[in-house]
């Protein structure tokens, strides 16, 4: 990139540069016509018959250098061929010399600095590549010469450029003074500012473009060369922030459109919002979940939104005394998640009708919550209680939902408690054909014993047809029609309103061999 300090092609008013000495044949400011047929201000000198060693000087106005260390001067000039000038002396030249002088202010006058190589600094002696020539009977022909010179290094606030003619017939058609700078550059989402090179190469720190963040690693830098070009080298750059994607050839970050998101900084483009989510604004790093949908804390920002599951279905209970086996089917709606678990809530109602959460005497196997399989075994149920179990399905977002958790209920009523087994049977009297038995009244928890059932059979006769039953309302019984001298096995169970209790242990009794022994009491 070139930054112009002076361009005479753009000047419309007289340039009014300083000449020295003030004599005839000096540089003269004239109107000219450039390649685009625009009128331009030019300087012409044509004193080809001067005395040897006599110089004509032309000096520009003071030019602020604007931070440039090296300045370039492009000269466009024409020059007449000495051979075409019949009256040209031997001092006719086809070259001229360019100088500069630095100063911190516009302090030069018509006489100072002294018009000589020191204090002026010589840049170059310029020779014409193309000479304008005229041959008799033909038009004059020629071409414009273009020459670019380099001035510097410069250190003061500004400078003057000077031209020394020592016998040429020439016109300075235009002077373009400029310096080179590295243009503002955006690469890999990193902006490098416009930089004026102060040395052969200058490191320049970059900054991230709007809505970009630095990539890991060293901060990005590029080298600005003296010729105003950025040195080609890979740039560890920046990347677009969450909610933004690279655009326009990696030169800017563009906000994700509505309905799209980008969760992380770095490469990659905005993606459509995942299931059950939306973004109503541009530049979304995350899509908001629809009402009733959530992301668990451990879910990635780009994960779909999910909802708690519906209730489990078809709870089946199997009661076995004080233990209960429950099993159910998975919910119809999983909520879009894999982390499905089940939990149970339990209430118990006493026979009198007062209800409360289940007590700690119940045990759940494998547990009351975090069940991964659709079943549980509940132990320690109390008789004649009504239990209500609410089976809920849960997933990773159930805790985020407000409102009631859907459940599938099941009611189970345990049997009332039957009398305990009758075990302390004793024989109060025996004969060859009968046995009189008595036992202690068992403690029935649910009301009094209504009656008893005695079960007996001859020892060794195990078939169902040999078993006989006898009901009695008293805690005694007489077994008649027995075999003489035979052994009998006897069991008793009690009945209350809750039903029969279990038979007690078998009691072993024996009838008398003969009648003479008579009735006698016999202890069990």
């Amino acid at each position: 990139l070139e930054e112009t300090l002076l361009n005479t092609k753009l000047e419309t008013a007289d340039l009014k540069w300083v000449t020295f000495p003030q004599v005839d044949g000096q540089w003269e400011e004239l109107s000219g016509l450039d390649e685009e047929q625009h009128s331009v201000r030019t300087y012409e000198v044509c004193d080809v018959q001067r005395a040897p060693g006599q110089a004509h000087w032309l000096r520009t106005g003071w030019v602020p250098r604007r931070g440039a260390v090296h300045v370039y001067a492009t000269l466009r000039f024409t020059m007449l061929e000495c051979l075409s000038l019949p009256r040209a002396g031997r001092s006719c030249k086809e070259t001229f010399t360019v100088f500069y002088y630095e100063s911190d202010a516009d302090t030069a006058t018509a006489l100072t600095p002294a018009w000589m190589e020191n204090p002026y600094i010589k840049v170059d002696t310029v020779a014409a590549e193309h000479l304008t020539r005229k041959r008799p009977g033909a038009e004059a022909t020629g071409k414009v010469n273009v020459k670019t010179l380099r001035l510097g290094p410069l250190s003061k606030a500004g400078f003057y450029l000077a031209f020394q003619d020592q016998g040429a017939c020439m016109a300075l058609l235009s002077l373009h003074l400029f310096y080179k700078k590295c243009a503002q550059l955006t690469v890999n989402l990193t902006r490098f500012p416009e930089t004026v090179p102060r040395e052969l190469v200058v490191p320049v720190a970059g900054s991230c473009v709007v809505d970009a963040v630095p990539a890991p690693g060293p901060s990005p830098s590029l080298y600005c060369r003296e010729d105003g070009q950025w040195a080609e080298q890979p740039v560890t750059g920046c990347s677009c922030a969450p909610g933004f994607e690279a655009a326009e050839g990696n030169t800017k970050c563009r906000a994700c459109a509505q309905g799209t998101f980008k969760p992380l900084s770095g490469e990659g483009s905005c993606q459509p919002c995942p299931a059950n989510s939306h973004s109503n604004t541009i530049g979304s790093a995350v899509c908001q979940c629809r009402v009733g949908y959530f992301r668990a804390r451990t879910d990635p920002r780009g994960a779909p939104c999910t909802t708690p599951p519906s209730a489990p279905r078809s709870v089946v209970s199997r009661l076995n005394g004080s233990s209960l086996h429950l099993e159910w089917s998975a919910p119809l709606e999983s909520g879009g998640r894999e982390d499905l678990t089940y939990a149970l809530r339990c209430r118990e109602c006493r026979p009198g009708g007062s209800c409360a959460p289940c007590g700690g005497d119940l045990t759940f196997d494998p547990g009351p919550r975090d069940l991964v399989e659709p079943w549980v075994v509940v132990r320690g149920l109390r008789p004649d209680f009504t239990y209500t179990f609410e089976v809920t399905a849960l997933n990773g977002v159930s805790s985020l939902a407000t409102g009631p958790v859907p459940f599938e209920p099941v009611n189970v009523t345990t049997d009332r408690e039957v009398p305990p087994a009758v075990s302390d049977i004793r024989v109060t009297r025996s004969s060859p054909s009968s046995l009189s038995l008595a036992w202690a009244v068992p403690r029935a928890p649910s009301g009094a014993v209504l009656d008893y059932e005695v079960k007996y059979h001859e020892k060794g006769a195990e078939g169902p047809s040999s078993v006989r039953f006898l009901k009695t309302s008293e805690n005694r019984a007489e077994l008649r029609g027995l075999k003489r001298g035979a052994s009998y096995l006897v069991q008793v169970r009690a009945r209350s309103e809750a039903g029969y209790g279990p038979f007690g242990q078998e009691h072993h009794s024996q009838t008398q061999l003969d009648e003479s022994e008579g009735w006698r009491e016999q202890l069990a």
């Epitope: 004239l30 016509l33 390649e35 007449l80 075409s84 004059a140 414009v144 017939c169 016109a171």
Partner: antibody
Framework: QVQLVQSGAEVKKPGSSVKVSCKAS????????ISWVRQAPGQGLEWMGK????????DYAQKFQGRVTITADESTSTAYMELSSLRSEDTAVYYC???????????????????WGQGTLVTVSS | DIQMTQSPSSLSASVGDRVTITCRAS??????LNWYQQKPGKAPKLLIY???ILQSGVPSRFSGSGSGTDFTLTISSLQPEDFAVYYC?????????FGQGTKVEIK
């Protein structure tokens, strides 16, 4: 502003010669083209020839070749046009005119004449 | 020498009229053509050079066009001071030539 001042009116006999001068005042002279143009009474403009003083030689219209001589003196910034073997049809106003741009300061040699002398009436009569 | 033919030789027009004068060269002269205006008793005045470049100080109602052999001078809205004789002038050759002139008169 450059001025071109021409010499005064002349009355000449047929067969004689006339030399008209054109003095340029102010600034560069050597690298501009100086043309000579004549205009007979009630007639149009007629280009006779031109000179670029620094080059010395002149270019002439075919019609006047051999009868006209255009010269320039750089030291006095004066151009001259001499016409010989005058005839009555050479009676005309003779103008000198300078080109808009020097030979060095124009990319295209349009030789457009933007400065004109006041004209010199040359009458050829016996 | 290259011959330049102007047409018309004369024309009558009113103030405000659009006037067009043409000039034809006997051979290709690229755009090396100039136009002049001359009023009675005065030296010619340069209007246009290079076929279409307006000389400094000349009103913008004057315009020129053309290249090769056919050229046009146009006055977009004739003013009282524009009644004069107009000449084309070719400078393509070492030997310049003028057209015979076009007189613009008041109708």
């Amino acid at each position: 502003q450059v001025q071109l001042v021409q010499s005064g009116a002349e009355v000449k006999k047929p067969g004689s010669s006339v030399k008209v001068s054109c003095k340029a005042s102010g600034g560069t002279f050597s690298t501009y083209a100086i043309s000579w143009v004549r205009q007979a009474p009630g007639q149009g403009l007629e280009w006779m020839g031109k000179i670029i003083p620094i080059f010395g030689d002149a270019d002439y219209a075919q019609k006047f070749q051999g009868r006209v001589t255009i010269t320039a003196d750089e030291s006095t910034s004066t151009a001259y046009m001499e016409l010989s073997s005058l005839r009555s049809e050479d009676t005309a106003v003779y103008y000198c005119a300078r080109s808009s741009y020097t030979i060095l300061t124009t990319y295209y040699n349009y030789n457009a004449m933007d400065n004109w002398g006041q004209g010199t009436l040359v009458t050829v009569s016996s | 020498d290259i011959q330049m033919t102007q047409s018309p030789s004369s024309l009558s027009a009113s103030v405000g009229d659009r006037v067009t004068i043409t000039c034809r060269a006997s051979q290709n002269i690229n755009n090396f053509l100039n136009w002049y205006q001359q009023k009675p008793g005065k030296a010619p005045k340069l209007l246009i050079y290079g076929s279409s470049i307006l000389q400094s100080g000349v009103p913008s109602r004057f315009s020129g066009s053309g290249s090769g052999t056919d050229f046009t001078l146009t006055i977009s809205s004739l003013q009282p001071e524009d009644f004069a004789v107009y000449y084309c002038h070719q400078v393509s050759d070492t030997s310049d030539t003028f057209g015979q002139g076009t007189k613009v008169e008041i109708k």
